[in-house]
């Protein structure tokens, strides 16, 4: 009669739970036997980030952090089954946590807008493309973003209209701006569940051009033209 | 005859910690996995937790997490727990049991604790 | 955490009575993790019945358990002096392990 190891009830464990789920819920749960009859004690082994803890007696899995699905779903980790007792004879499977996505990320912009500028004068008003995204899951359909002006006084000199629902433009609302820097805020609401806004500054120079770039005294880089 | 033998009553000031025993008896402690029970006259029987002795792996009750800490030896056939920061509430008698199929098959006399000032 | 509620309480019967105490959870418990023990005043509690309906070593067998889900049950078909005691029900079915909060049998 050779002594066997516990045998898991499956090769591969699925859960699937909301990323937002308070610490100490149960996730999931593991099964084995022991073809001896022998109880088993459960492990957990790869549990790299931290996330879930066993109840070693039951095969119960809990969170112990919160959870994010933008940093990776599903989650997987290993499970071991001991013997107790016996010969400690062990068996592994995979439990595989699949992370549902809650509308967490607040808008952003899509690059780095530095060096977005105008020839000062303005011989009309001008305008200029800007990009929206975040980091939550859009089945089905992209992102849906809307925008406006992050703050009231802006709506004498700026006004923000959407081209698509990662898209807007962003036009001057008269020809009468300073050589100087104006940091335009934008405010963008992902529409989500719940909606999130996100308020980003686009950083405009109105300056003197050379050759249709910005003079910037020697030393200083050229900006790049954006409208 | 399988047996499990703890330490001695406790009286002990809020604050402090406290570490009882459970010496088994008649087996070998690494067969089965060793649990704490709390009795109380107003809450009755609380699991505290568990530990395997073969590994260690432990599962404690959430309640517990904090301030309880279970350890074996396996050389003296003894289980420890610790709980540390006490509070009057934790004044009880407190029962170390060894399991099977997860059920409680023998159980030892109880550590009684008292925590005054 | 699952809740399990024991009822009654307190139980009075004459020797030769049929006692049945109750015990309810407040989610579904796997049958097989469902336990009863009898504690007399000053010892430790003693494994009555284990897996629902299995009798312990040395129990008599006038002792019956059953039930299922969230309800279960321990019968005495006929109450013996020496049953006097409280007992608990127990569920490790889910962690943690919660036991009831007992049912004092008291022998008139």
């Known amino acids: 009669d050779v002594n066997e190891a516990p045998q898991f009830s499956q090769h591969v464990f699925q859960a699937k739970v909301s990323e937002d789920v308070a610490i100490g819920t149960k996730v999931g749960n593991v099964t084995a036997k022991d073809p001896e009859g022998l109880d088993i004690s459960y492990s957990l082994r790869g549990d790299t980030r931290g996330w879930l803890k066993i109840d070693h007696v039951t095969g119960e899995i809990f969170s112990v952090a919160p959870l994010d699905r933008e940093a990776g779903s599903p989650y997987r980790v290993q499970v071991v089954a001991t013997e107790v007792g016996g010969s400690s004879l062990s068996s592994v499977s995979e439990f595989h946590l699949i992370l549902m996505d809650v509308n967490d990320n607040p808008p952003r912009l899509a690059k780095d807008y530095t060096g977005l500028f105008f020839c000062h004068p303005l011989s009309a008003p001008g305008s200029l493309i800007f990009e929206a995204t975040d980091d939550d899951q859009h089945l089905f359909r992209g992102p849906h973003f809307t925008f406006s002006l992050g703050s009231g006084s802006l709506q004498n000199d700026w006004e923000v209209s959407k081209i698509n629902g990662t898209h807007a433009r962003l036009s001057t609302r008269h020809t009468e701006f300073e050589e100087r820097e104006y940091v335009v805020l934008i405010r963008i609401n992902d529409g989500g569940r719940p909606p999130l806004e996100g308020i980003v500054s686009l950083p405009v120079t109105f300056c003197s051009c050379v050759e249709g770039s910005c003079f910037r005294p020697a030393g200083h880089k050229h900006h790049h033209h954006h409208h | 005859e399988v047996q499990l033998q703890q330490s001695g009553a406790e009286l002990v000031r809020p604050g402090a910690s406290v570490k009882m025993s459970c010496k088994a008896s008649?087996?070998?402690?690494?067969?089965?996995?060793i649990h704490w029970v709390k009795q109380t006259p107003g809450q009755g029987l609380e699991w505290i937790g568990a530990?395997?002795?073969?590994?260690?792996?432990?599962s404690y009750n959430q309640k517990f997490t904090d301030r309880a800490i279970l350890t074996v030896d396996t050389s003296s056939n003894t289980a420890y727990m610790q709980i540390s920061s006490l509070t009057s509430e934790d004044s009880a008698v407190y029962f170390c049991a060894r399991s099977f199929r997860r059920y409680f098959d023998v159980w030892g006399a109880g550590t009684s604790v008292t925590v005054s000032s | 955490d699952i809740k399990m509620t024991q009822s009654p309480a307190i139980v009075s019967a004459s020797p030769g009575e049929k006692v049945t105490m109750t015990c309810r959870a407040t989610?579904?418990?796997?049958?097989?993790?469902l336990q009863w023990y009898q504690q007399k005043p000053g010892s430790s509690p003693t494994l009555w019945i284990y897996s629902t309906s299995n009798l312990a070593s040395g129990v008599p067998s006038r002792f019956s358990g059953s039930g299922s889900g969230t309800s279960y049950s321990l019968t005495i078909s006929s109450v013996e002096a020496e049953d006097a005691a409280t007992y608990y029900c127990?569920?490790?079915?889910?962690?943690?392990?919660?036991f009831g909060s007992g049912t004092k049998l008291e022998i008139k």
């Open positions: 530990i395997y002795p073969g590994n260690g792996d432990n």
């Open positions: 989610s579904s418990v796997s049958s097989s993790y």
């Open positions: 008649g087996y070998t402690l690494t067969s089965n996995n």
């Open positions: 127990q569920q490790y079915s889910s962690s943690p392990s919660t």
